[in-house]
Interface confidence: medium
C-alpha cells in the first residue's frame, strides 16, 4: 500500500510511511514542502479553496482546526480556522496551536513530560481507541498494541501526535500520517499562510521544537515572497 499526506497540531489522521519525505533528524530539510502534487509527469498545484472547507481537523493546516465559523452555526458548514493560542478556550487538542494541548478547556503548553503521558489517555475523538501504532523499524512479528502500547517510532503510522514517541509528531505523508521528527533549529519549516494557497500538504513537515519558531531565514529577506525560505529559529 502506498504513501500519504496531511497536517495539524497533534497532526491528526494518517497511516505509516507511505510516500512523502521521511524527515530524518540528521537532515537539514526534514520533509518535502508539499503543497504540490505530481500529476502525470509534472508537479501541479492542488486545487485551492478559500476559505478552505473541511470535514475534520486532518484536512487543515498545522496551525488550524476544522469547525463551524460561527458559534452554534450550521454544523454542516465547516472551514479551517486559526488555531487557539496559549490560554485561549478549547474543546479538543486540535484547536490548540502546535506546542500546546487542550486541558480543562484551556490551551496550555505541552511540556514534553506532562503532555506525552496525559494526552494519550484523554483523547476521545471519534476514532475509538483500537488504533495501534506500527514500529517504523524492521520487525518480523506484530505485537498487539492493546497489550504493548508503545509509542510509535519514526515511520510508524499514526492518527495524532500523541501516538508518537517523544520528539516526533504525526504528520501527513501522503498515504497516511506517520511519526516524523519535530524540527530542530536550522531545519526548513513550513509557514502556513492564513489566506490563499490553501491545500493539503502531500508531504507534511512537523512543527518546530520547543523554544523555536518558523521564521524567514535572515539572508532570504530580499528574496521574492514565493521563494522565501523559512527555518526553525530561536525565539
Amino acid at each position: 500500500t502506498l504513501n500519504s499526506v496531511l497536517n495539524s497540531n497533534a497532526i491528526k489522521n494518517l497511516p505509516p510511511p507511505l510516500g512523502g519525505a521521511a524527515g530524518h533528524p540528521g537532515s537539514a530539510v526534514s520533509a518535502a514542502p508539499g503543497i504540490l502534487y505530481p500529476g502525470g509527469n509534472k508537479y501541479q498545484t492542488i486545487d485551492n479553496y478559500q476559505p478552505y472547507p473541511c470535514a475534520e481537523d486532518e484536512e487543515c493546516g498545522t496551525d488550524e482546526y476544522c469547525a463551524s465559523p460561527t458559534r452554534g452555526g450550521d454544523a454542516g458548514v465547516q472551514i479551517c480556522l486559526a488555531c487557539r493560542k496559549r490560554r485561549k478556550r478549547c474543546m479538543r487538542h486540535a484547536m490548540c496551536c502546535p506546542g500546546n494541548y487542550c486541558k480543562n478547556g484551556i490551551c496550555v503548553s505541552s511540556d514534553q513530560n506532562h503532555f506525552r503521558g496525559e494526552i494519550e489517555e484523554t483523547i476521545t475523538e471519534s476514532f475509538g481507541n483500537d488504533h495501534s501504532t506500527l514500529d517504523g523499524y524492521s520487525r518480523r512479528t506484530t505485537l498487539s498494541s492493546k497489550m504493548y502500547h508503545t509509542k510509535g517510532q519514526e515511520g510508524s503510522v499514526c492518527l495524532r501526535s500523541s501516538d508518537c514517541a517523544s520528539g516526533l509528531c504525526c504528520a501527513r505523508h501522503f498515504w497516511s500520517k506517520i511519526c516524523k521528527p519535530v524540527l530542530k533549529e536550522g531545519q526548513v519549516c513550513t509557514k502556513h499562510r492564513r489566506k490563499g494557497s490553501h491545500g493539503l500538504e502531500i508531504f507534511q513537515r512537523c512543527y518546530c521544537g520547543e523554544g523555536l519558531s518558523c521564521r524567514i531565514q535572515k539572508d532570504h529577506h530580499q528574496a521574492s515572497n514565493s521563494s522565501r525560505l523559512h527555518t526553525c529559529q530561536r525565539h
Epitope: N3, V5, G19, H24, E56, D130, V157, F174
Partner: antibody, heavy 112, light 111 residues
Framework: EVQLVQSGAEVKKPGASVKVSCKAS????????IHWVRQAPGQGLEWMGW????????TYAQKFQARVTMSRDTSSSTAYMELSRLESDDTAMYFC?????WGQGTLVTVSS | QSVLTQPPSVSGAPGQRVTISCTGS?????????VHWYQQLPGTAPKLLIY???NRPSGVPDRFSGSKSGASASLAITGLRPDDEADYYC???????????FGGGTQLTVL
C-alpha cells in the same frame, strides 16, 4: 521531474529468487519511503512493504515477511525488492511507489 | 478476500453518474485512516484520483469526487465518459494488520 524506473521483465523457475530494482531520480532519494505493491494478472493491488530510503528501515506485510527483503543503495538512488522461494502464484506485475509517483512496473513470471 | 470491500463491477451510460463504494471496518476507514482512490487503465500503473477521502489532485476533473461516512468511503463519477472505463481501487491503512490495504477493485464499464 520525479521518475521511478524499474528493471525489466524476469522469468524464473519455482523455488528461485528474483530481485527487482527501482531507480529514483528528480528528487532527494533519502527523503522518501519506497513502497512495493504487486498485482497478479487480472487481480487487485497488494501492498508488500516499504523501506525508509535514508535509514534502510523496513516494514513488510505479514504475508511476505518470511520471503521478502527490501534494500536500497543511496549512492545510486536505487531501491530493491527481493522475493525468494518463488511459486507460480507470485507471477505478477511488481510496482515500486513513492506514494505519489509509481514506477512503470516489472513483470515477474514464475514458470517451470 | 480484500479487507476493503468494493463491488466487482459497475456500469453506466455516457453522461450518467455512478458511485463506487468501499466498505471497511473499525480497524481501517472507521478508525480514521485516510482513504485514497486510484484509477488503473489496462497495462499501466495506478493513477491517483482522490486522496484523503475527498481531495482531488489538480489535473483530475471535478467529475470525480470522494466522500466518507463511518467505516465506508465512496467515489462518485458524474458525466460518465468512454475513457473513464478502467479499474478503480480504494486504499487505506489497517491497524490490526499493520498494513496498507487495497479494495479488490471495481471495473467500470461505460455502456
Amino acid at each position: 521531474e520525479v521518475q521511478l524506473v524499474q528493471s525489466g521483465a524476469e522469468v524464473k523457475k519455482p523455488g528461485a529468487s528474483v530481485k527487482v530494482s527501482c531507480k529514483a531520480s528528480g528528487y532527494t532519494f533519502t527523503d522518501y519511503y519506497i513502497h512495493w505493491v504487486r498485482q497478479a494478472p487480472g487481480q487487485g493491488l497488494e501492498w508488500m512493504g516499504w523501506i525508509h530510503s535514508n535509514s534502510g528501515a523496513t516494514t513488510y506485510a505479514q504475508k511476505f515477511q518470511a520471503r521478502v527483503t527490501m534494500s536500497r543503495d543511496t549512492s545510486s538512488s536505487t531501491a530493491y525488492m527481493e522475493l525468494s522461494r518463488l511459486e507460480s502464484d507470485d507471477t505478477a506485475m511488481y510496482f515500486c511507489s513513492r506514494e505519489d509517483y509509481w514506477g512503470q512496473g516489472t513483470l515477474v513470471t514464475v514458470s517451470s | 478476500q480484500s479487507v476493503l470491500t468494493q463491488p466487482p463491477s459497475v456500469s453506466g451510460a455516457p453522461g450518467q453518474r455512478v458511485t463506487i463504494s468501499c466498505t471497511g471496518s473499525s480497524s481501517n476507514i472507521g478508525a480514521g485512516y485516510d482513504v485514497h482512490w486510484y484509477q488503473q487503465l489496462p497495462g499501466t500503473a495506478p493513477k491517483l484520483l482522490i486522496y484523503g477521502y475527498s481531495n482531488r489532485p489538480s489535473g483530475v476533473p471535478d467529475r470525480f469526487s470522494g466522500s466518507k461516512s463511518g467505516a465506508s468511503a465512496s467515489l462518485a463519477i458524474t458525466g460518465l465518459r468512454p475513457d473513464d472505463e478502467a479499474d478503480y481501487y480504494c486504499q487505506s491503512y489497517d491497524n490490526s494488520l499493520s498494513s496498507y490495504v487495497f479494495g479488490g477493485g471495481t471495473q467500470l464499464t461505460v455502456l
